[in-house]
């Protein structure tokens, strides 16, 4: 046998090129037959209506052929013939890659809540071979499950994703990839995750900046409530009391001027949205004011100089505890 | 040497029919495709059908199809045309000719005449 | 009637050059390969050029072929006397699924 062909592999609509090789050459004619066994070209000769088929190359040693816009139809074995004595046939085989024709992602719920398991689709239609479909939520690559349908040599292959949604997935993308030997680079289509969870709330001091509460001084809290969606409804309450009549609410700030003993408790920063509702407590200690200790005095009968020394006395039972946080969040 | 003999021509009234033969040797005729082709007097040549090496592909001049038919016998190296309902400008010189597109060799020719 | 197109005539002194022409179409030369036949008075055509080009053993270099787009030539170079002959070219119709012929170009040595 002296007769060589190669296997083909194109993507649809590309160009196929066929060969006939003769190794060594007796000026014995060559052929080539499609899957049906109709001529292509006999020497140069191409019976065949279909243009697409256009010689390269035609000699002795070699016929080479090629097939533009190359469709699913086209797939199969193509025989090439030399008339030797006895003649020889050898096939080559022409596979047709079909990348996806469409890539569809379909979210079960457009907003979903923290905590819900949600069902994400991802469609890669009409293929050949099957697609293989990759999922990743950000950089996360998640495992999904895949159904293969075939009709009339095509696949189309659905992938579902169960997925349970946390508040840190909102704005996330979620990615369907998909892997095809027709396809170079990424093909991919991503949809982006909208998750609602309850606020999150914080309560900040603004002021004193140092952090130690004193009688007679001002306190000023803020409360940062965060959720999605955002939060309507911020409110101050003090837990198991009124709220002082000095205190002064507004908005998402409470300030309380010229403390005092009485004022100590828990102030609670409550805040709610439609997926429910969170609250931050602090706990407010007031300090005993600064004390001022008398100094002691000289005298002298010629010549009077009086020195009059004021040394302040900082004394706070709770002093190691100055800078420590007082707020908890619920 | 190539050789391509052809015979079977003559006088015909227009209605009838003929066979032409054309007797192959010096090259293995099972590996060609072979031609018919013919040539009226004072005029250019006419391709009027092909036939492939196995006889599965045949090919015609829209002016002969239905009436004639081309075939083959492998085994005795020979080529045939069956002429019917023979027309008066079927009047030629037939040729029988080596290749299916490229003729590389032909016969001596026959005459065929159709005329009452 | 012939679908490809040649030049009735054509003629030169010995030693000149002479150029002959074929026109046809998309589904003849535009896609297929072109063949040129000498004929001989009184003889059987003889094929002088087969794949466009290409020259089969025995065919003097003086004859050479051509094709760009859906024309083909042939061209003679150092036309001599014996070269006094009818030529034709030739070649497949895919839309037609049939060979195909020039109408011919006489060419005579002055």
């Known amino acids: 046998q002296n007769l060589f062909t190669k296997d083909v592999t194109v993507i649809e609509g590309e160009v196929a090129t066929i060969s006939c090789q003769v190794n060594k050459s007796d000026d014995s004619v060559i052929q080539l037959l499609n899957p049906n066994r109709q001529t292509i070209y006999f020497r140069d000769f191409r019976p065949l209506k279909d243009s697409r088929f256009q010689l390269l190359n035609f000699s002795s040693s070699e016929l080479k052929v090629s097939l533009t816009n190359v469709s699913i139809s086209d797939e199969g074995r193509y025989f090439c013939q030399l008339y030797t004595d006895p003649p020889q046939e050898s096939y080559t085989t022409i596979t047709v890659l079909v990348p996806p024709r469409n890539l569809m992602i379909d979210i079960q719920k457009d907003t979903a809540v923290e905590g819900e398991e949600i069902e994400v689709n991802c469609t890669a239609m009409a293929s050949k071979p099957a697609t293989t479909i990759r999922w990743f939520k950000g950089n996360t690559e998640l495992k999904g499950k895949s159904e293969v349908e075939e009709w009339s040599d095509m696949y189309t292959v659905t992938s579902q994703l169960m997925l349970k949604v946390h508040k840190e997935d909102d704005g996330v993308p979620v990615i369907c990839q998909v892997e095809h030997p027709a396809v170079t680079g990424n093909l991919q289509t991503q949809r982006y995750l909208e998750v609602q969870y309850k606020p999150q709330v914080h309560i900040q001091m603004t002021y004193p900046l140092q952090g130690l509460t004193r009688e007679g001084d001002a306190l000023e809290l803020t409360c940062e409530a965060i959720g999605k969606p955002q939060p309507v409804m911020v409110t101050w309450v003090r837990v198991d009391d009124e709220m002082p009549q000095h205190a002064v609410l507004s908005g998402p700030n409470l300030f309380i001027n010229n403390l005092n003993k009485t004022d100590n408790g828990t102030y609670r920063c409550e805040a709610s949205n439609i997926v429910g509702k969170a609250h931050s407590d602090y706990m407010l200690y007031v300090y005993d004011p600064p004390t001022t200790i008398p100094p002691p005095t000289t005298t002298t009968t010629t010549t009077t100089t009086t020195t009059t020394t004021i040394l302040t006395i900082i004394t706070d039972s709770r002093a190691g505890e100055e800078g420590s946080i007082r707020a908890v969040d619920h | 040497e190539v050789q391509l003999v052809e015979s079977g021509g003559g006088l015909v009234q227009p209605g009838g029919s003929l066979r032409l033969s054309c007797a192959a040797s010096g090259f293995t005729f099972s590996s060609y495709w072979m031609s018919w082709v013919r040539q009226a007097p004072g005029k250019g040549p006419e391709w009027v059908a092909n036939?492939?090496?196995?006889?599965?592909?045949?090919y015609y001049v829209d002016s002969v199809k239905g009436r004639f038919t081309i075939s083959r016998d492998n085994a005795k190296n020979s080529l045939y045309l069956q002429m019917n309902s023979l027309r008066a400008e079927d009047t030629a010189v037939y040729y029988c000719?080596?290749?299916?597109?490229?003729?590389?060799?032909w016969g001596q020719g026959t005459l065929v005449t159709v005329s009452s | 009637q012939s679908v490809l197109t040649q030049p009735p005539s054509a003629s030169g002194t010995p030693g000149q050059r002479v150029t002959i022409s074929c026109s046809g179409s998309s589904s003849n030369i535009g896609s297929n390969t072109v063949n040129w036949y000498q004929q001989l008075p009184g003889t059987a055509p003889k094929l002088l050029i087969y794949s466009n080009n290409q020259r089969p053993s025995g065919v003097p270099d003086r004859f050479s072929g051509s094709k760009s787009g859906t024309s083909a030539s042939l061209a003679i170079s150092g036309l001599q006397s014996e070269d006094e002959a009818d030529y034709y070219c030739g070649t497949w119709d895919s839309s037609l699924s049939a060979g195909v012929f020039g109408t011919g170009t006489k060419v005579t040595v002055l």
């Open positions: 036939i492939k090496q196995d006889g599965s592909e045949k």
């Open positions: 000719a080596r290749g299916g597109g490229r003729h590389d060799y």
